[in-house]
């Protein structure tokens, strides 16, 4: 069977422009090595917004540059992006790939609507 | 703008070695896998060879298996095809394809000639 | 391994006429499911991706559709330029497969 991938429809970043949602994935077989990628679609156009690896049992490790930090549990990934603004509101595709051991396999969800809405200003105080 | 361009096809004996290149540029090349991709003469498409992110992160059609060797070199964004042992039926043009970021094949190269005769 | 099988082999229509092409895949690929055009002396040209999302530049005309293990390409109105060879493919897991190919011709 090909690899079913889910996520939430809809996600709220908060008032610090951060956003967190879990991608859930149902493994055909016994993977130990996992690549998790966050992708963003914004009209026809997808970009990488961030993607790492890990092996089984262990944390998830973006680059150091990265918006984005996870956590692992069994088939479950936990994702949080951070930095965002309103600009950024859009479609985020969890996408899984089983590396390791053969056969790959690759799953992709439909994508968590994140809506971002950036702070009012504080007001002046006299 | 992303551009695959394969070389190293030609005219080798049954038995003897071949091995193509893909340069690509206009993206980011090592965020991506790569696949090989055949079509002999009046045929359709056979997928070959993938190569995955890490470079020993790799997979071969069973007719690929233990003859060719699929590598890269993410600091010259080039894709290599080493072809062993070649035989008359892998006489095909073959084509270097991005695997795109929601997993088909976006980009193709315009494809080298490879003809395995005597 | 996955199996896709294309019907017909060949298609012979008019301009302006409505195609519908078919692939079935032997076991679930779930929204893998992608089509390429290729015309004589080219490379493929991808047309569809998950089913029926439309790749970049990819005309209205062409639309995908179906689920599980029954996919069509249809093209809602020939032009000249669609006269050629299309290849369904899934791309879910390996080994990645073509099927064996429709070939849409002038009548």
């Known amino acids: 069977k090909a690899m079913h991938v889910a996520q939430p429809a809809v996600v709220l970043a908060n008032s610090r422009g951060t956003a967190s949602f879990v991608c859930e994935y149902a493994s055909p077989g016994k993977a130990t090595e996992v690549r998790v990628t966050v992708l963003r679609q914004a009209d026809s156009q997808v970009t990488e917004v961030c993607a790492a690896t890990y092996m089984m049992g262990n944390e998830l490790t973006f680059l150091d540059d990265s918006i984005c930090t996870g956590t692992s549990s069994g088939n479950q990934v936990n994702l949080t992006i951070q930095g965002l603004r309103a600009m950024d509101t859009g479609l985020y595709i969890c996408k899984v790939e089983l590396m390791y051991p053969p056969p790959y396999y690759m799953g992709i969800g439909n994508g968590t609507q994140i809506y971002v809405i950036d702070p009012e200003p504080c007001p002046d105080s006299d | 703008q992303v551009q695959l361009v394969e070389s190293g096809g030609g005219v080798v004996e049954p038995g003897r070695s071949l091995r193509l290149s893909c340069a690509a540029s206009g993206f980011t090349f090592s965020s991506y896998g790569m696949h090989w991709v055949r079509q002999a003469p009046g045929k359709g498409l056979e997928w070959v060879a993938v190569?995955?992110?890490?470079?020993?992160?790799?997979d071969y059609a069973d007719s690929a298996k233990g003859r060719f060797t699929i590598s890269r070199d993410n600091s010259k964004n080039t894709l290599y095809l080493q072809m062993n042992s070649l035989r008359a039926e892998d006489t095909a043009v073959y084509y270097c394809?991005?695997?795109?970021?929601?997993?088909?094949?976006?980009?193709w190269g315009q494809g080298t000639l490879v003809t395995v005769s005597s | 391994e996955i199996v896709l099988t294309q019907s017909p082999g060949t298609l012979s229509l008019s301009p302006g006429e409505r195609a519908t092409l078919s692939c079935r895949a032997s076991q679930s690929i779930n929204s893998y499911l992608a089509w390429y055009q290729q015309k004589p002396g080219q490379a493929p040209r991808p047309l569809i991706y998950g089913v029926s999302s439309r790749a970049t530049g990819i005309p209205d005309r062409f639309s995908g559709s179906g689920s599980g293990t029954d996919f069509t390409l249809t093209i809602s109105r020939l032009e000249p330029e669609d006269f050629a060879v299309y290849y369904c493919q899934q791309y879910g897991r390996y080994p990645f497969t073509f099927g064996p190919g429709t070939k849409v011709d002038i009548k």
């Open positions: 394809a991005r695997g795109g970021l929601l997993g088909y094949f976006d980009y």
């Open positions: 190569i995955w992110y890490k470079p020993s992160e790799k």
